[in-house]
Interface confidence: low
């Protein structure tokens, strides 16, 4: 028998620094998580203890810190090659910046192989990104040969920037033939590293012949076997052992996000390559393992550039910016309206032409703004002024939902009207009309929607059967501020760019901005 | 460990109100997150979900039953009450009162109280 | 409101079998199933929920497949304690149930 031992990554979102354990900013030291420092530390030392190690990491390196925002991918390249990672998956964030973003910050500087088996380049694109990415990689590990087989959510043109030139595939039909190419190459050890989430990682396990082990990310679930030791639930034991359509056993693996857990995840193989054990859970990189100084040293030299970018001017408003509780927990409030309209252009994707966009809708809790910005400063706006609006770092995320679920959301906005509380509904591309007058589940009295398969997008009344995309935090999309049915119902979820990078791109893009109330939200009894 | 006792009364008449109070222990309704919703089972067929209540007193119903049901809380007794009214001898049920876990299963029940609906 | 279509009804099988229940959904539900066990006079058990995971202290003979309407519920080997009644729920809109299989032993 041989063993491997699996290191794995995946959803790490620019967590290069050490977080809370809550994946937000440090703030106590003493018990933060994660960070690449504490990651090679844990990584040196089970290379120094074991024989056969892989490093991998699964995609979505990028986006989730105003380290994206700066460096947009320089510094995933420079820790990935310092950690000495062994391969990675695309994941659709690393689309952000479109295919220019990948590949001169990543592509060009990774020392690692970066794989997908189902993306394919076309047109002009197809020789200038011939090379940088592969399908798979056959890597020497002791004195036997591993096979990487990539993929990426094929929902990446929804949700990223990947543009015209690049086909992405059905996973399981453009892992199979790549596959089967490395069993002709005798290679008998095949994992398939990608970024679909866990409903597909685990169809892959089932479907796909001679993989033996896959290794996911994007739906960032959380594995363990015996008590968690954190605050992540599990979503089933670690690894998850599917049965394939031909009997295998296969483990199916992923590592929560944000770089606050290290896979470890020990494969027996025997002679002809069979999985006859497979054992592990992720490692809490908790401040009991130490930063590795050396890596920590770089970090702080890369930091110096952060702090100067967070003083300097995104862009200037000419009007106040109300992000007041005063106004945002009772009425449509400027500041509302203006990060959704950051939202929707953030996700503008002409991907059919039936379509002017695939989402017009946004909605945003009112307790998530937490601060106005006076334009009285010059007009000033800056990353740090945002930071104060949003300051919880989290993400805009896409999600399909039943007319139904809306209705109920909206219910839910206005249910305990008037006590100040977080859930009152700021929205884009949404009319909504209060009569606070009628009975907490019956206060909804017009509900139109902004249409997306038309040319000329006008408001038509919400269809309760209808399934919408919808632009969110992902506070809501995970049933905060009461939002139960929500997370409950919802049909989709895709985790989105950072919050304030969002509408700071917005605001850089548009240069001066003056965001009214306009009647997004009106009351149809009372005084509002 | 987490506890729930439904009570209420054996035997109601036809038209009457029933009012139903579940208690429980080993968990808080003021915990963000938690919630207890109401099942009932008819001598010999299968289950169905009436109402439940969130720790924010948020209320969720059977829609072919709602404009008979009011679901209430009381977080300082660990209580909820459960009314339903205009009842009917097709009501006769046992009625279980659960804990609703993250999504809407239930893991904690109580042992149930039977209801039966006669003149 | 979805149906939960759970079949047999009934069924008998000896201790050691293999027993398999399906639940069908009338529209998608994606993996927003559970499985309970209920025996006579008693509250209902959770033994799977998200369709395949095992509830904490179940055995591991009884397991959960299937997503978006088709759903199976197996016993690897059956034994006399797991004589009960079975119901499917789904969560994915307000929560339904099935009908129930009523499994006896041979």
């Known amino acids: 028998a041989w063993e491997l031992t699996i290191l794995h990554t995946n959803d790490v979102h620019s967590r290069l620094e050490q977080t809370s354990e809550d994946s937000s900013k440090c703030v106590n030291a003493s018990r933060c998580m994660g960070g690449v420092a504490r990651l090679f530390t844990k990584v040196q030392q089970i290379r120094r203890a074991e024989p056969n190690v892989l490093l991998l990491d699964a995609g979505d390196q990028y986006q989730g810190t105003i380290w994206f925002t700066v460096y947009k991918g320089a510094e995933v390249a420079h820790f990935m090659n310092a950690l000495r990672y062994d391969a990675m998956a695309l994941g659709n964030h690393e689309f952000d910046n479109g295919v220019e973003g990948l590949i001169e910050p990543l592509l060009k500087e990774a020392k690692f192989p970066i794989l997908s088996a189902n993306i394919k380049a076309k047109g002009p694109l197809a020789s200038q990104i011939s090379g940088l990415y592969l399908p798979y990689k056959v890597l020497p590990v002791g004195d036997e040969v591993v096979g990487i087989v990539g993929y990426t959510s094929k929902e990446t043109p929804f949700l990223s920037n990947p543009g015209t030139n690049l086909v992405f595939e059905d996973e399981i039909t453009a892992l199979q033939p790549e596959v089967d190419k490395l069993k002709t190459l005798n290679v008998n050890k095949i994992i398939a590293l990608g970024h679909s989430g866990f409903e597909m990682d685990k169809l892959i396990a089932q479907k796909v012949r001679g993989v033996d082990v896959v290794v996911g990310g994007h739906s960032n679930t959380f594995l363990y076997t015996g008590n968690p030791p954190s605050k992540e639930v599990p979503a089933g034991k670690y690894p998850f052992i599917v049965t394939s359509d031909d009997g295998r056993k296969v483990p199916v693996v992923q590592a929560y996000a944000f770089g606050k857990y290290l896979g470890y995840l020990k494969i027996e193989f025997d002679e002809r390559g069979n999985v006859i054990s497979s054992h592990g859970n992720p490692i809490l990189l908790n401040s009991s393992i130490p930063e590795d100084p050396s890596i920590k040293a770089d970090i702080n030299k890369w930091r110096i550039k952060l702090d100067n970018y967070s003083t300097q001017e995104l862009g200037k408003t000419i009007v106040y910016l109300d992000g007041s509780s005063q106004s945002c927990r009772f009425r449509e409030c400027n500041m509302g309206n203006l990060i959704c309209d950051a939202m929707i252009n953030n996700n503008l994707r002409h991907t059919d032409e039936m379509f002017w966009n695939h989402v017009s809708m946004c909605i945003l809790n009112g307790g998530g703004i937490r601060s106005p910005i006076d334009e009285r400063n010059n007009g000033t706006i800056t990353w740090e002024n945002l930071a104060a609006v949003l300051p919880f770092g989290g993400t805009f995320d896409l999600v399909q939902l039943k007319g139904s679920t809306l209705k109920k959301a909206f219910e839910h906005s206005v249910h305990r009207y008037g006590q100040s509380t977080g859930e009152f509904l700021q929205v884009g591309g949404i009319h909504v009309v209060y009569d606070l007058s009628r009975k907490p589940g019956d206060r909804v009295v017009k509900l139109d929607v902004l249409c997306t398969k038309c040319r000329v997008p006008s408001y038509d009344p919400l269809k309760m059967d209808e399934v919408y995309k919808v632009i969110l935090p992902n506070f809501l999309a995970n049933g905060g501020d009461g939002f139960q049915m929500i997370k409950d119902e919802l049909l989709r979820h895709d985790s989105g760019d950072q919050d304030i990078n969002v509408v700071s791109t917005y605001i850089s893009k548009m240069k001066v901005i003056y965001p009214a109330v306009e009647g997004r939200i009106k009351f149809s009894t009372g005084s509002h | 460990q987490v506890t729930l006792r439904e009570s209420g009364p054996a035997l109601v008449k036809p038209t009457q109100t029933l009012t139903l109070t579940c208690t429980f222990s080993?968990?808080?309704?003021?915990?963000?997150?938690?919630?207890v919703g109401w099942i009932r089972q008819p001598p010999g067929k299968a289950l169905e979900w009436l109402a439940h209540i969130w720790w924010d007193d948020d209320k969720y119903y059977n829609p072919s039953l709602k404009s008979r049901l009011t679901i209430s809380k009381d977080t300082s007794k660990n209580q909820v009450v459960l009314t339903m009214t205009n009842m009917d001898p097709v009501d006769t049920a046992t009625y279980y009162c659960a804990r609703r876990e993250r999504w809407a299963w239930f893991a904690y029940w109580g042992q149930g109280t039977l209801v039966t609906v006669s003149s | 409101d979805i149906q939960m279509t759970q079949s047999p009804s009934s069924l008998s099988a000896s201790v050691g079998d293999r027993v398999t229940i399906t639940c069908q959904a009338s529209q998608n539900v994606f993996t927003n199933v559970a499985w309970y066990q209920q025996k006579p006079g008693k509250a209902p058990k959770v033994l799977i929920y998200s369709a395949s995971y095992r509830y904490s202290g179940v055995p591991s003979r009884f397991s959960g497949s299937g997503s978006g309407t088709d759903f199976t519920f197996t016993i690897s080997s059956l034994q006399p304690e797991d004589i009960a009644t079975y119901y499917c729920?789904?969560?994915?809109?307000?929560?339904?149930f099935g009908q129930g299989t009523k499994l006896e032993i041979k």
């Open positions: 729920q789904q969560y994915n809109s307000y929560p339904t």
């Open positions: 080993g968990f808080s309704l003021s915990t963000s997150g938690m919630g």
